[in-house]
């Protein structure tokens, strides 16, 4: 194939791949008709002047996972057709000015996972056709004004995993075509008003894992096309009342891992397209009426690991499409009989790790499609007669770690459980706490020395131990994990992870479709 170097493999499709630790310089001679060149996992430490001079038809060049620490300014001369250039996962600390000069066709530039300390406006001033710029995983401490001013066609900019402590309000002002901006895992403490005003086409904004304490009230007011907003793992203690007011396209909002104590009235909305709202690991103590009432399409609401002790009976008004509600690991002692009345489409509810002492008999009256209920580790001594009778789709019910009182009043529940054992799972069964003579015995097989009253319990089919959700898309859109598991570390849906570790930790989400932002 027009002379393939011995260290490389060349395919008919004009693709050349050179890999291996024995390679210490760009192999020669490279086939003149090469359109794609990959130099991976080598010991190349520098790129000298014009090593690619004779392969001017090259469209894609990947020089990744090498020891590359120095590049001569003319290294990419004569690559006018190059559309994709990756220098990711090397050891670059400095980019020479003019390095990308002449790369008039360049659309994607990947400089991620290096050791870059700074970028300057002159670095990218020639890259007027650039659509994607990846700078994440470097050591950048600031971005100078003008750095991206010439990149008017840019649609994707990743500055995550750097050391940015502040952002100038002017740095993104010319990026009117930007659709994705990632600033996650930096050290930002605040973002000046106006920073995102020019980003009228922005669809995704990732600000998670910074140290942001306050959001300016109008910070997102120009971002009407925003669909995904990640604000998790910051230091946000309150949300200005109007901060999310102009986001009609938003479908995912993550706020978990902040210091929110309350949710301002009207804070969420109108957001007719929001599907997921992640609020776990905050300090929320109560939920007033109508706090989510603008979120008519919300399907996943995660409120676990807060300090919620009171839920107003109208707190979930408007959530007619909600499928998953996580309230576990809070301080709930009481639930008003009307609190879940609006949740007609709810499938999964997790209430474990609270202090519930009893449940209203009609608490699930309108929620006929429930498939999974987590009630373990509360203070329940009994449950009202018939509380689950109408739940024909219920296939997962967790009742263990409650102080069940096994007197004659427990018989209706015991009889129902006998007929519905498959729903309880086999891992842990509910056991009696009192009276003392039966403590520790299984509630299901307990012998209560009282005449068993006649209890009509409808026959139910045998359900699988773990619910099955048909047509569940695979990660990254949704991660299906058992209701007693959690992802060990929250991941955004754009990460490059190919596997997700799952741990059997019952103290966490308790969701059947758990994925964090």
């Amino acid at each position: 194939y027009h002379g393939c170097p011995s260290e490389c493999t060349c395919s008919r499709a004009s693709q050349v791949e050179c890999t291996g630790a024995r390679i210490v310089a760009v192999p020669t001679p490279l086939p003149w008709n090469a359109m794609s060149l990959q130099i991976l996992n080598t010991h190349i430490t520098e790129l000298n002047e014009s090593p690619f001079l004779n392969i001017s038809a090259l469209i894609a060049l990947r020089i990744e996972k090498n020891e590359l620490s120095r590049i001569t300014p003319g290294a990419f001369r004569n690559l006018g057709s190059l559309r994709y250039l990756s220098l990711a996962n090397n050891k670059l600390q400095v980019l020479p000015i003019g390095l990308f000069q002449g790369l008039d066709s360049l659309e994607s530039l990947l400089l991620s996972s290096n050791q870059l300390l700074q970028i300057q406006p002159a670095h990218f001033s020639q890259c007027s056709n650039l659509k994607e710029l990846q700078l994440h995983g470097n050591h950048l401490e600031y971005i100078p004004d003008g750095a991206f001013d010439h990149l008017v066609g840019l649609t994707k900019l990743n500055l995550g995993k750097n050391s940015l402590t502040h952002i100038s309000p002017r740095v993104f002002q010319h990026l009117g075509n930007l659709q994705v901006l990632r600033l996650y895992e930096n050290r930002l403490t605040d973002i000046p008003m106006g920073t995102f005003d020019g980003l009228v086409n922005l669809q995704e904004l990732a600000l998670q894992q910074n140290q942001i304490g306050l959001l300016s009230p109008g910070l997102f007011h120009n971002n009407h096309n925003l669909q995904r907003l990640y604000l998790s793992n910051n230091h946000i203690s309150q949300l200005p009342p109007s901060v999310f007011m102009q986001l009609p396209q938003l479908n995912r909002l993550t706020l978990f891992g902040n210091s929110l104590k309350e949710l301002s009235p009207g804070i969420f909305g109108p957001m007719p397209n929001l599907r997921e709202l992640w609020l776990y690991d905050n300090h929320i103590s109560s939920l007033p009426d109508n706090v989510f009432s603008n979120l008519r399409q919300l399907q996943v609401l995660i409120l676990s690991r807060n300090q919620i002790s009171f839920i107003s009976p109208g707190a979930f008004n408007g959530l007619t499409e909600l499928r998953e509600l996580s309230l576990h690991t809070n301080a709930l002692q009481d639930l008003d009989g009307n609190v879940f009345r609006m949740l007609a489409n709810l499938q999964n509810i997790s209430l474990q790790n609270n202090r519930l002492r009893q449940l209203p008999g009609n608490i699930f009256a309108n929620v006929n499609g429930l498939m999974a209920i987590q009630l373990q580790n509360n203070q329940l001594e009994n449950l009202p007669l018939g509380i689950f009778d109408h739940l024909g789709k219920l296939c997962e019910l967790r009742l263990y770690d409650n102080p069940w009182r096994c007197d004659s009043d427990i018989l209706p529940l015991r009889n129902w459980l006998l007929l519905n054992q498959p729903r309880l799972g086999t891992d842990t069964v509910p056991v009696c706490f009192s009276p003392a003579n039966v403590r520790g015995q299984s509630l299901i097989i307990i012998n209560v020395n009282v005449a068993v009253p006649s209890v009509h319990v409808p026959e139910v089919p045998s359900y699988p131990e773990t619910p099955w959700y048909p047509d569940t898309p695979s990660y990254p859109d949704t991660t299906s994990v058992s209701s007693t598991t959690e992802l060990t570390s929250p991941v955004e849906d754009y990460t490059d992870l190919t596997t997700i570790q799952v741990t059997d930790d019952r103290s966490v989400w308790g969701m059947t479709q758990a994925q964090s932002g």
């Epitope: 007033p288 009426d289 009976p313 109208g314 009481d334 009989g337 009307n338």
Partner: antibody, heavy 118, light 107 residues
Framework: QVQLVQSGAEVKKPGASVKVSCKAS????????INWVRQAPGQRLEWMGW????????KYSQKFQGRVTITRDTSASTAYMELSSLRSEDTAVYYC???????????WGQGTLVTVSS | DIQMTQSPSSLSASVGDRVTITCKAS??????VAWYQQKPGKAPKLLIY???YRSSGVPSRFSGSGSGTDFTLTISSLQPEDFATYYC?????????FGGGTKVEIK
Amino acid sequence: QVQLVQSGAEVKKPGASVKVSCKASGYTFTDYYINWVRQAPGQRLEWMGWIYPGSGNTKYSQKFQGRVTITRDTSASTAYMELSSLRSEDTAVYYCARWGYGAYFTYWGQGTLVTVSS
Amino acid sequence: DIQMTQSPSSLSASVGDRVTITCKASQNVGINVAWYQQKPGKAPKLLIYSASYRSSGVPSRFSGSGSGTDFTLTISSLQPEDFATYYCQQYNSFPYTFGGGTKVEIK
């Protein structure tokens, strides 16, 4: 239908205590919060606190904290509001009220007039 | 505590008149406002909840509007049985508080 029936009028001396009852019917008493609201002559309505009859948990307005005690007897489906250290300005009609589908007062008792006079 | 300031404190009107009562909250309460009607010697009666939703059995001449801090109760065509005192209430945060009332009298 939901009904809340309160005890009759009371006349008390300053420093004394009064206990007003509210008997609920037409629904499961233990499943819904019951509130107490008062109205002094010519004054606005004032929320005093609530009880969740199922557990006995209470929440009181800071203004009445330490002087008001709300209790319940689940076997009698009755909630009680006791106000101590009565003063003349505690002269008011005291209402029990139950929330509906939100934290607004859909159902009210008929009211109990408490007069504090020496 | 959130203050609910109601105005006017009283008004005189005739049957068939359009009557508007306003209520201003000292801080944002979203739509968590209710309106009640009270007649002498009687308990209050719920008219409007969530700022604009009519309670069951309430005539359509009663309507509510507003959000945040400013709320309005409107009676489109006053009827003889509407002469009473009207109260607004916020139930967004504890302690729940009421307005001072508006007495609607016959002109």
